[in-house]
């Protein structure tokens, strides 16, 4: 068992352009607190997890009144320590959350009114009974400052909290098998307390307050002899006297959970889901209020005055379950229009929208056709986040604003010379072709290939393509 | 209980201006985005005009571009839109509409009754 | 902009009966299609967003479905209070627009 401490130094604007306007002003004073989340472990799957470690709010901070034109400074802070207890092993890795809150104070219709100002999160490497560790973390604009560590609570000791010292029964030496305590030299390693009433002679633990069963045995304090007649759920080796299958210890034998919590194996340990008004890692903390701050992740609590009414946790965007604990994948939803890439901060949503889009959700069409006039008769044709005009006859360019050149792309064959027209080209056709491009050759008696030529026109003569 | 009521419809002569009001209430106003959508008499719902929650974003239909103005006061729950250069055309009931959280969908998930703007001379 | 079909404009139904409405996009609006509802009164309520999702409180008799430029709004069983006017609204790429409406009307 032992304590986290977490002490905030400063939270204030960060370094660089684009300082943050004070959250308070003279017509909305306001005053911050801070809350801290902790779970174990360093990897991904932590974050699934609700707070396991633990969570703590700070008190209130002074009062704070913006001074008018003044740039943010750094905020009143709240007194004291963060202290999130834990009851077992320090796990010596861990992730935190902690959020700065502004409790706005003007005349607000039921009571204060409450908003997060900044989130910051991270993993890291601790070992309990080691020096404060300092810190530097930024959320958007804001800068926070703070210090951390983990100290065992007596008699525990060790970076893991998990060794129990005594006093020395003897000036000179401890007892059989049992180390002195560093650095105390001068107490001695203590065995293991296991949880009381844990049978001596078929129960053992690893760790304080636990108890874990010997082949054959079962029940909370393992005094249950295993029925040898059923033989369910086989897990342990092959009993030689029934030749049947007896369950050994499983993580959810005995159900480590209480308060009527439902125990679920886990690929390394267990997991305890609580009824509504319990919590901690075997439910085991009751009474919930909302004073005890039992929603995370910025969660509204409404209700649960007194521990005997339930509370209900309002969970922001972003997060689910009865607590709040649960991340909900905000960018699986694709709410960035048009290929936009999406970033889920955690405190907001951002998309990083393709050329050619913009707005918060990449849903404004820069390109398209609105607003946008084909000159010329032409017409706008829309999609993709880019618009071309299909131009009418005689007209080119990206407007319709440039007069085409009949004759540019050559149109006349077989070195027919091409002539501009009010209503499109004419090709004058060299000798011994026709059509409308020249591109029939005339044939010697004086008949055409395909197609005749029109009544009245020679071989040889301009012909108008309109 | 999510509530917007629209007031300060009207008759106006074209060319003549109105400001339409939506007072909110039931939910924290500064964390959403509010519409403006329009109905004239037996047509159907033409979106008009949009402001984020915190007034940075704003759009606007072509048909009202450059004539309406929309915009919000967090601290007294209200959202505006100033309607200048009226035609008769944009004669209609007027709805004020919440959007969504984080605008992830752009719906408009909570409207107002409407408040009636005839412009006619 | 994109344009907003909905079809029928109008259709005569009987209690109980399964009703389908469908609107059609002149684009690809990657699901993000909404559908309202219109009592005669005028006031107007969300029932599915994001082409399927019911909004709270919304009957599970609604349901939507769809993707790219189709979409459908299914009333399973058409109840008394489900005669008025439907619309679908794209919120994929602005101007937002909605469909010329359905009018389920009683048979």
């Known amino acids: 068992a032992g304590v986290f401490e977490l002490q905030i130094h400063s939270f204030g604007p960060g370094p660089g352009p684009g300082a943050p306007r004070s959250p308070c002003s003279a017509r909305l004073p306001c005053r911050l607190f801070f809350r801290v989340c902790l779970k174990p472990g360093l990897s991904e799957e932590a974050a699934e997890s609700p707070c396991a470690l633990g969570a703590a709010l700070s008190a209130r901070g002074p009062v704070y009144t913006e001074q008018p034109g003044a740039p943010a400074p750094d905020l009143p802070l709240p007194d004291g320590l963060l202290q999130v207890p834990f009851r077992d092993a320090w796990p010596g890795t861990f992730s935190f959350i902690i959020e700065t809150w502004r409790e706005e104070l003007g005349d607000q219709i039921g009571g204060p009114a409450w908003s997060l100002l900044a989130r910051v999160a991270g993993r890291r490497r601790l070992a309990a009974g080691g020096p404060w560790a300092r810190d530097i973390q930024r959320a958007g604009a804001w800068e926070l400052r703070f210090s951390y560590r983990a100290r065992c609570e007596p008699p525990a000791v060790g970076t893991a909290c998990t060794r129990l010292c005594r006093p020395r029964s003897a000036p000179s030496r401890c007892g059989p098998g049992l180390r002195p305590c560093a650095p105390l030299e001068d107490e001695c390693e203590a065995p293991l307390v296991c949880r009381a009433g844990c049978s001596p002679e078929h129960g053992f633990c690893e760790q304080p307050g636990e108890c874990r069963c010997l082949e054959g045995w079962t029940g909370p304090l393992c005094t249950v002899p295993v029925s040898t007649s059923s033989c369910l759920s086989p897990r342990g080796p092959s009993s030689a006297t029934t030749g049947c299958l007896v369950p050994g210890p499983g993580p959810c034998d005995g159900n480590p959970c209480a308060n009527g919590g439902s125990c679920s194996e886990t690929p390394r340990s267990f997991e305890c889901t609580c009824p509504r008004g319990f919590y901690g890692l075997r439910c085991e903390v009751s009474g919930v209020t909302c004073a005890d701050g039992p929603c995370f992740n910025g969660g509204l609590c409404v209700g649960g005055a007194d521990p005997d009414s339930a509370y209900i946790c309002h969970c922001p965007p972003g997060f689910q379950g009865s607590n709040c604990e649960k991340r909900v994948d905000r960018c699986s939803l694709q709410p960035c229009r048009n290929g936009g890439l999406c970033l889920d901060l955690g405190h907001a949503l951002r998309c990083r929208c393709r050329a050619g889009f913009a707005g918060p959700r990449c849903e404004h069409d820069l390109d398209d056709c609105a607003g946008r006039a084909c000159a010329n008769g032409g017409t706008c044709v829309e999609g993709g986040g880019a618009h071309r005009c299909s131009c009418a006859l005689g007209f080119g360019g990206r407007d319709c604003r440039e007069r085409a050149d009949p004759c540019a792309a050559r149109p006349c064959a077989h070195g027919g010379r091409c002539y501009a027209h009010f209503s499109g080209l004419v090709c004058a056709c060299a000798p011994g072709y026709m059509g409308a491009r020249c591109e029939f050759p005339v044939h010697p008696d004086g008949a055409s290939a395909l197609p005749a030529a029109p009544p009245g026109l020679r071989p040889g003569d301009p012909q108008r393509y309109l | 209980e999510v509530q917007l009521v629209e007031s300060g419809g009207g008759l106006v002569q074209p060319g003549g201006s109105l400001r339409l009001s939506c007072a909110a209430s039931g939910f924290t106003f500064s964390d959403y985005g509010i519409h403006w959508v329009r109905q004239a008499p037996g047509k159907g719902l033409e979106w008009v005009a949009y402001i984020s929650s915190g007034g940075y974003t704003i759009y606007y239909a072509d048909t009202v571009k450059g004539r309406f103005t929309i915009s919000r006061d967090n601290a007294k729950n209200s959202l505006y839109l100033q309607m200048n250069s009226l035609r008769a055309e944009d004669t209609a009931v007027y709805y004020c509409?919440?959007?969504?959280?984080?605008?992830?969908?752009?719906?408009?998930?909570?409207w107002g009754q409407g408040t009636t703007v005839t412009v006619s001379s | 902009d994109i344009q907003m079909t909905q079809s029928p404009s109008s259709l005569s139904a009987s209690v109980g009966d399964r009703v389908t409405i469908t609107c059609r996009a002149s684009r690809d609006i990657t699901k993000f299609l909404n559908w309202y509802q219109q009592k005669p009164g005028g006031a107007v309520k969300l029932l599915i967003y994001y082409t399927s999702r019911l909004h709270s409180g919304v009957p599970s008799r609604f349901s939507g479905s769809g993707s790219g430029t189709d979409y459908t709004l299914t009333i399973s069983s058409l109840q008394p209070e489900d005669f008025a006017t439907y619309y679908c609204?794209?919120?994929?790429?602005?101007?937002?627009?909605f469909g010329g409406g359905t009018k389920v009307e009683i048979k």
């Open positions: 509409a919440r959007g969504d959280y984080d605008d992830i969908f752009y719906t408009m998930d909570y």
């Open positions: 609204q794209q919120g994929n790429t602005l101007p937002w627009t």
